[in-house]
């Protein structure tokens, strides 16, 4: 089941997906002055059996300008701009994206693309949040939203993290900075 | 069904302490922000803070800083509100609200009055 | 702390008619602003958040717009049951503040 909506925007941060559920779709996208070939797929798709994953199709771009010529899917990183999914700079990755059965990797980048990611997320998939530069978590607790079905409808927890600009002093007045551990993710309102 | 529930309403003398609670339900108690929110009679709503239950990490409004301490146990899905000397300008309406940002469930509401 | 301003203070309307209310901020605030209305003795209900998104459940009447400092909330068709108190409030930069309110009465 594809989730209606994107995972919630919060003030200041970023969310990226250290992996994806199978059913997860990312558009074939060019960047401008560039189109999908002709006859070329319209999306990549993860799919997989029960020991492994991976992306089906494969996106190609090729000049606006020319009809003939053909942009082989390899990896450039000058090609790697920022996305809505840019790799996290988080020294702590909360998944290995190896490990997690019936997940595909983020797919490496193709010649050309467009410098935003658009995927179709589903139900079960988890992305992760951390404040933009220039901004800091205001605790360690949960960082994540997790797209629900509740009563039929697909919907987002909200992600529980505030993230306040680098002139506040490193420690808030009156902030009480416990010793315990990041709490489990947000789970969403039990049933009606 | 989400529901924040409120103790009762308070009538103090200056000088007193207080604490009034906040029940959280229907949802994961732990893992959202609870803020508070003053309302004096007769006028808008103030923002006075917010603590997060899983850790007790709190933080306070400029305003409130010094005056009023949050706290919560997550065993009873419970936040508090704290006052060790109540003053005449605490009458007010307090509403306890699931965060963090936009504020999507409130509480009732608990009425503290402070009257000699 | 970011000000948040609302106009007008009070209006007076009648059942029908389109109603505007404005929400100032003394700075940007992007799109992170929700609207909430408040009847009297009861606590306060979200209507809108990220500036124009519907919270589930509240009437279609009910719009809101804008992004940066100026915002606006909308309601379409005044009914009987809109007759409240309109808070806006920030969320960009924390401490979160609320507008002073704006009173929708009876004309």
């Known amino acids: 089941e594809l989730c209606d909506d994107d995972p919630p925007e919060i003030p200041h941060a970023t969310f990226k997906a250290m992996a994806y559920k199978e059913g997860t779709m990312l558009n074939c996208e060019c960047k401008r002055g560039f189109r999908r070939i002709k006859s070329g797929s319209l999306y990549m798709l993860c799919t997989g059996n029960s020991s492994h994953s991976s992306w089906d199709n494969q996106c190609q771009c090729t000049s606006s300008a020319t009809r003939n010529t053909t942009k082989q899917v390899t990896p450039q990183p000058e090609e790697q701009k920022e996305r809505k999914t840019t790799e996290m700079q988080s020294p702590m990755q909360p998944v290995d994206q190896a490990s997690l059965p019936g997940h595909c990797r983020e797919p490496p980048p193709w010649e050309n693309e467009a410098t935003e990611r658009i995927y179709h997320f589903v139900v079960g998939q988890m992305v992760y949040y951390q404040c933009v530069q220039g901004y800091r978590a205001l605790h360690r607790g949960p960082a994540e939203s997790v797209c629900k079905m509740t009563h039929g409808k697909t919907r987002w927890t909200q992600p529980q993290l505030i993230c306040t600009g680098e002139m506040e002093t490193s420690q808030f007045p009156g902030e009480e900075k416990p010793q315990a551990s990041p709490e489990g993710r947000p789970e969403s309102e039990t049933s009606c | 069904e989400v529901q924040l529930v409120q103790s009762g309403a308070e009538v103090k003398k200056p000088g007193e302490s207080l604490k009034i609670s906040c029940k959280g339900s229907g949802y994961s108690f732990s893992n959202y922000w609870i803020g508070w929110v003053r309302q004096m009679p007769g006028k808008g709503l103030e923002w006075m803070g917010i603590?997060?239950?899983?850790?007790?990490?709190?933080k306070y409004s400029p305003s409130f800083q010094g005056q009023v301490t949050f706290s919560a146990d997550k065993s009873t899905s419970t936040a508090y509100l704290q006052w060790s000397s109540l003053q005449a300008s605490d009458t007010a309406m307090y509403y306890c609200?699931?965060?963090?940002?936009?504020?999507?469930?409130w509480g009732q509401g608990t009425l503290v009055t402070v009257s000699s | 702390d970011i000000q948040m301003t609302q106009s007008p203070s009070t209006l007076s309307a009648s059942v029908g008619d389109r109603v505007t209310i404005t929400c100032r901020a003394s700075?940007?605030?992007?799109?992170?602003l929700a609207w909430y209305q408040q009847k009297p003795g009861k606590a306060p209900k979200l209507l809108i958040y990220k500036a124009s998104s519907l919270e589930s459940g509240v009437p279609s009447r009910f719009s809101g717009s804008g992004s940066g400092t100026e915002f606006t909330l909308t309601i379409s068709s005044l009914q009987p049951d809109d007759f409240a108190t309109y808070y806006c409030q920030q969320y960009s930069s924390y401490s979160w503040t609320f507008g002073q309110g704006t009173k929708v009465e009876i004309k």
């Open positions: 700075q940007s605030v992007s799109s992170w």
């Open positions: 603590i997060s239950p899983g850790d007790s990490t709190t």
């Open positions: 609200v699931r965060g963090p940002y936009y504020l999507d469930y």
